[in-house]
Amino acid sequence: HNTTVFQGVAGQSLQVSCPYDSMKHWGRRKAWCRQLGEKGPCQRVVSTHNLWLLSFLRRWNGSTAITDDTLGGTLTITLRNLQPHDAGLYQCQSLHGSEADTLRKVLVEVLADPLDHRDAGDLWFPGESESFEDAHVEHSISRSLLEGEIPFPPTS
């Protein structure tokens, strides 16, 4: 897998899309997880509806939403009210039993709001959270890194 970079602006929303082969992944639930370290665990943030036929229903965990177009083969994740600590390496996953296949590796970069005239270092940071913080979609730029560039290992 190569890694796709999605850039979002602090305070705004970011939409991440993960295309996949709808036939190959037919009947499988999907998930969005955050890689806590280069060889560390990929911590589940949110997953699609327990009933695969209802995967089109948007599910939220805090500020992160997930919805799956199972016919079109596109998993969509929305990060609302993006904060600097939402940056990082994530994975879109297809679940089967206790296993997970990686659909796409995503690097989220959070930029300071250019309309916010405070110094970047003065950005407001919400309270601590064990999960990956509270969540529409206005601003997203993505680019794919070259194949073979990726230093990230698969989920452990």
Epitope: T3, V5, Q7, L36, G37, E38, G40, P84, H85, D86, A87, G88, L89, L107, V108, E109, V110, L111, A112, A120, G121, L123, F125, P126, E128, S129, E130, L145, E149, I150, P151, F152
Partner: antibody, heavy 119, light 107 residues
Framework: EVQLVESGGGLVQPGRSLKLSCAAS????????MAWVRQAPTKGLEWVAS????????YYRDSVKGRFTLSRDNAKSTLYLQMDSLRSEDTATYYC????????????WGQGVMVTVSS | NIVMTQSPKSMSLSVGDRVTMNCKAS??????LAWYQQKPGQSPKLLLY???NRFTGVPDRFTGGGYGTDFTLTINSVQAEDAAFYYC?????????FGGGTKLELK
């Protein structure tokens, strides 16, 4: 193997400027946030500044804001720290570090470069 | 800013001993804590992140625990090469702040 090699340190008078460089190798530089952490002689560690992977946003500790400028050249896999209006309290070993994006911990460190601000 | 306080400031142990050092945050930081080791004349090295995840190559005698405001770093069966300063760091939310360090000496 991840390597971070700092250069550009030295003795400088208060009020003057200095530019540190950090040459990175062994990983895809443009995929990572980078940061500088400093350590005053016989003191503890102090985060100085961080930069997103594209260089689109920078974050500074309050005491260096407006004086230090962090930048990067992804084509050259190099990180820079331009330090202006230096003060005696900026005297420290400056470490170039790779930051795990969004988590703020530093998984790889350079060997450090000494900056001495004195008249 | 959240203040990280480490204790004790220094400790002296023998090879094979079990050591526990502490890090206290002035506010709840969840599990958002990292530990570093710095040997004399060297740069710091990451040991643990998110409280208990060992970084690549870190021996399993190093374990982290705690949650909220109180954290521990335990070294089971201390080795001579473990003589160093140990620093905790609040992570995940900026600004990143470090504790003052604990010096581990071996008798």
């Amino acid at each position: 193997e991840v390597q971070l090699v700092e250069s550009g340190g030295g003795l400088v008078q208060p009020g003057r400027s200095l530019k540190l460089s950090c040459a990175a190798s062994g990983f895809t530089f443009s995929n990572y946030y980078m940061a500088w952490v400093r350590q005053a002689p016989t003191k503890g560690l102090e985060w100085v500044a961080s930069l997103t992977n594209s260089g689109g946003s920078t974050y500074y500790r309050d005491s260096v804001k407006g004086r230090f400028t962090l930048s990067r050249d992804n084509a050259k896999s190099t990180l820079y720290l331009q330090m202006d209006s230096l003060r005696s309290e900026d005297t420290a070993t400056y470490y170039c570090t790779r930051e795990w994006a969004g988590s703020g911990y530093f998984d790889y460190w350079g060997q450090g470069v000494m900056v001495t601000v004195s008249s | 800013n959240i203040v990280m306080t480490q204790s004790p400031k220094s400790m002296s142990l023998s090879v094979g001993d079990r050591v526990t050092m502490n890090c206290k945050a002035s506010q709840n930081v969840g599990n958002n804590l990292a530990w570093y080791q710095q040997k004399p004349g060297q740069s710091p090295k990451l040991l643990l992140y998110y409280t208990s995840n060992r970084f690549t190559g870190v021996p399993d005698r190093f374990t982290g625990g705690g949650y909220g405001t109180d954290f521990t770093l335990t070294i089971n069966s201390v080795q001579a090469e473990d003589a160093a300063f140990y620093y905790c760091q609040r992570i995940y939310n900026s600004p990143w702040t470090f504790g003052g360090g604990t010096k581990l000496e071996l008798k």
